[in-house]
Interface confidence: low
């Protein structure tokens, strides 16, 4: 970005100063500003130099540079007040032409930034501004009247008050033109269309705008179509519409239709698809997978994608077991219209329980038939650990039980002294079991695994720990041996990741 | 035949809590699906929902009265009961309980008030 | 909260007339949309639910139609037992809002 000296966003001098303004960029620089006399410029590869020896009320106005070969468009400006007793405003254009409802800026430029407390616009000959003229002033820019009327074509002056007195600028004539209308305003209803070959179909094409001199047709792939055109007149706009009735429809009738309307201003269009089908169709999707993992406690939302024609006329979500026989909630179930064709529904499971594991069918029936779509929702657990004594061939063994989903990998961990958990300094030996016995592994239900430690010599003043981790968190199961037999340590809580 | 209505007093003082009950018979707010709500009309102006209980005891409020009401449900008596807080002339209304339901398709989003009390006109007033 | 507009708030028809009332909603309830008709003294009696579905029992010439947020029930003839005054409700979310109620009267 190139950058102003000196470095202020405002300058402030008298008629007659010399001032002199440098701008210095990467590459060449150039000046805009407003055109005003005795300014010399000159230029040195990188910076441009802006200067006057003789300042006058015509060189207030803002100085910008900038960077033509900077791809960014930086640029910097300086705001110039030359403040002249006599002249409290600068005039650069005296016509401004808008179109109606555009802001006009009136570029008068004040001289002087202590004047700003005291302006105000109003019409030539001191007259105050039409009612409900809104207006806002910079003394950077001038006065902005916002959203310009037509009937606000005016001579305007700026006013400012200086000594007690009201100093006007030089008149302003501002030209509102009435807007020319643009294209018209299209409607194609419907924007989708949808019928099984034999029925009825209607189409209808409507065009508006505030001049009659406007044309309107319906084409059908690049066909116009000769259809009687009805007219209206309403609330300020003329309306011509275009209602193509097809009694008995057929494939012919299919494809791409376009509303078309023309005027002076150019042409809008508008386009939507007429599917002719043999028969009802109800077709189930979902972007999910059909097959879903969550942990135990977290929530989940089913979402079913339906494009159906006709209209559904049932829809159902239902829970297929294999554990309870309740069903979804009403409340927890919603339905959502994408199009005329095509609808979402939801289930949302919040906070899930071990007997909502299970499959869940939704369910959808129009005449074309039932359809479904089934997810299978298994919950995830944090391993729970059980150890007990046992023998086995004669083998003093310890037998660990983990029950979790995803499968849990079992470890055994002994370490010295008597503790609930074995840490990293106690440990003497760590054993991982790579291929526990797999005891139950029934589908929607926890895993469960054993694991065997045979133990030739339980040491009494050691414990023995069994720990289980999936993906879920982890569990542990502490073997105490004691002269009087064994004894065993659950922890106080399984560690748990919901 | 499903019936609701409504009972309580009349006449309440400003600052003194209302407590209305909805008597019910007809259906059961133990099925499925079944809600009740409670929606008042304050004379010669609109509708205005209140609150809902559903048959899970799940209770939805008005939340620019929300810490003024309190809806519960005796389903052994068959009845449901709106408590409303610190009354004021403004609530001078007439007060409807309305059953939600029961239900064509068990998860279709159609939750509306099918049957209506005949409505308690309730005055606060000193 | 949705906010419900309902037009026009009143309105006058002769037996015969098709009649219709519309409700505007601040954003999207998906069709999640019932109306009601009340007479003097009475409660409310559940016309049209879920837009356009007619609740049993209530007469065929009352239609409900609409999508996104713009909803319309429609009489196609009025009979003298009509007039009435109407609202629309929506239980797309909470809090639930009803409409500011049309009261069609007898011209």
């Known amino acids: 970005i190139p950058v102003i000296e000196p470095s202020v966003p405002e300058l402030v001098v008298k008629p007659g100063a010399t001032v002199t303004l440098r701008c210095v960029g990467n590459g060449s620089v150039e000046w805009d500003g407003p055109p005003s006399p005795h300014w010399t410029l000159y230029s040195d590869g990188s910076s441009s130099i802006l200067s006057t020896n003789n300042a006058t009320f015509q060189n207030t106005g803002t100085y910008r540079c900038t960077e033509p070969g900077d791809p960014l468009g930086g640029s910097a400006a300086i705001h110039l007040y030359v403040k002249d007793p006599a002249r409290p405003w600068n005039v650069l254009a005296q016509e401004v032409v808008v179109f109606e409802d555009q802001d006009a800026l009136l570029p008068c430029l004040l001289t002087d930034p202590v004047l700003e407390a005291g302006v105000s616009l109003v019409r030539v000959r001191g007259r105050p501004l039409m009612r409900h003229t809104n207006y806002s002033f910079s003394p950077w820019h001038g006065f902005t009247i916002h959203r310009a009327k037509f009937i606000q074509s005016q001579d305007y002056q700026c006013s400012a008050l200086m000594g007690g007195r009201k100093v006007m600028s030089i008149s302003i004539r501002l030209k509102v033109q009435k807007v020319i209308p643009g294209p018209p305003a299209l409607t194609l209803v419907p924007a989708e269309l949808v019928r099984i070959r034999g029925e009825a179909a209607q189409i209808v094409c409507s065009a508006s705008s505030v001049d009659v001199n406007f044309d309107v047709f319906l084409q059908h792939n690049n066909t116009k179509l000769a259809i009687p055109q009805q007219s209206d007149f309403h609330n300020n706009r003329y309306q011509k519409v275009l209602t193509l009735n097809l009694d008995q429809v057929d494939f012919q009738h299919a494809g791409n239709y376009s509303c078309v309307a023309s005027n002076v201003q150019g042409k809008h269009s508008t386009s939507m698809f007429f599917r002719v089908v043999e028969s009802a169709y109800l077709n189930l999707s979902s972007e999910q997978n059909l097959i879903q993992e969550v942990t135990v406690g977290e929530g989940l939302n089913l979402k079913v994608m339906v494009e159906a024609y006709p209209g559904l006329q049932g829809f159902n979500w239902t829970y297929l077991g294999p554990f309870s026989d309740h069903q979804p909630e009403p409340k927890l179930a919603n339905a959502t219209t994408k199009d005329t064709y095509r609808h979402t529904f939801t289930l949302s499971l919040p906070r899930l329980k071990p007997s909502e594991a299970g499959r869940y069918s939704f369910l959808a029936r129009n005449p074309g038939g039932w359809r479904a779509l089934t997810f299978e929702l298994t919950l995830r657990y944090p391993p729970e650990v059980s150890v007990i004594w046992t023998f086995i061939n004669g083998s003093g063994t310890l037998l660990c039980a983990a029950s979790g989903y995803p499968q849990p990998n079992v470890t055994w961990l002994q370490c010295s002294g008597h503790t609930d958990r074995c840490d990293e300094a106690q440990v003497l030996q760590v054993w991982d079991d790579p291929y526990p016995e797999v005891l139950s592994q029934e589908p929607f239900h926890k895993v469960t695994v054993q694991s065997l430690l045979t133990v030739e010599t339980l040491e009494h003043n050691q414990t023995y720990e069994c720990r289980a981790h999936n993906s879920v968190g982890s569990g542990s199961w502490a073997f105490i041996p004691i002269s009087a037999g064994a004894h065993t340590h659950p922890p106080d809580e399984f560690l748990f990741t919901p | 035949e499903v019936t609701l209505k409504e009972s309580g007093p009349a006449l309440v003082k400003p600052t003194q809590t209302l407590t209305l009950t909805c008597t019910f018979s007809?259906?059961?707010?133990?099925?499925?699906?079944?809600?009740v709500g409670w929606i008042r009309q304050p004379p010669g102006k609109a509708l205005e929902w209140l609150a809902n209980?559903?048959?899970?005891?799940?209770?939805y409020y008005n939340p620019s009265l929300k810490n003024r009401l309190t809806i519960s449900k005796d389903t052994s008596k068959n009845q449901v009961v709106l408590t409303m807080t610190n009354m004021d002339p403004v609530d001078t209304a007439t007060y409807y309980c309305a059953r939600i339901g029961p239900i064509k398709y068990p998860t279709a989003p159609y939750r509306y008030f099918d049957f209506w009390g005949q409505g308690t006109m309730v005055t606060v007033s000193s | 909260d949705i906010q419900m507009t309902q037009s026009p708030s009143s309105l006058s028809a002769s037996v015969g007339d098709r009649v219709t009332i519309t409700c505007l909603a601040s954003?999207?309830?998906?069709?999640?949309l019932a109306w009601y008709q009340q007479k003097p003294g009475k409660a409310p009696k559940l016309l049209i639910y879920?837009?356009?579905s007619l609740q049993d029992g209530v007469p065929s010439r009352f239609s409900g139609s609409g999508s996104g947020t713009d909803y319309t029930l429609t009489i196609s003839s009025l009979q003298p037992e009509d007039f009435a005054t109407y609202y629309c409700?929506?239980?797309?979310?909470?809090?639930?809002?009803f409409g500011g109620g049309t009261k069609v009267e007898i011209k």
């Open positions: 954003e999207d309830i998906y069709d999640n």
């Open positions: 409700l929506q239980d797309s979310e909470y809090p639930w809002t």
């Open positions: 209980i559903w048959w899970d005891d799940d209770k």
């Open positions: 879920y837009a356009s």
């Open positions: 007809g259906f059961s707010l133990t099925t499925y699906g079944m809600g």
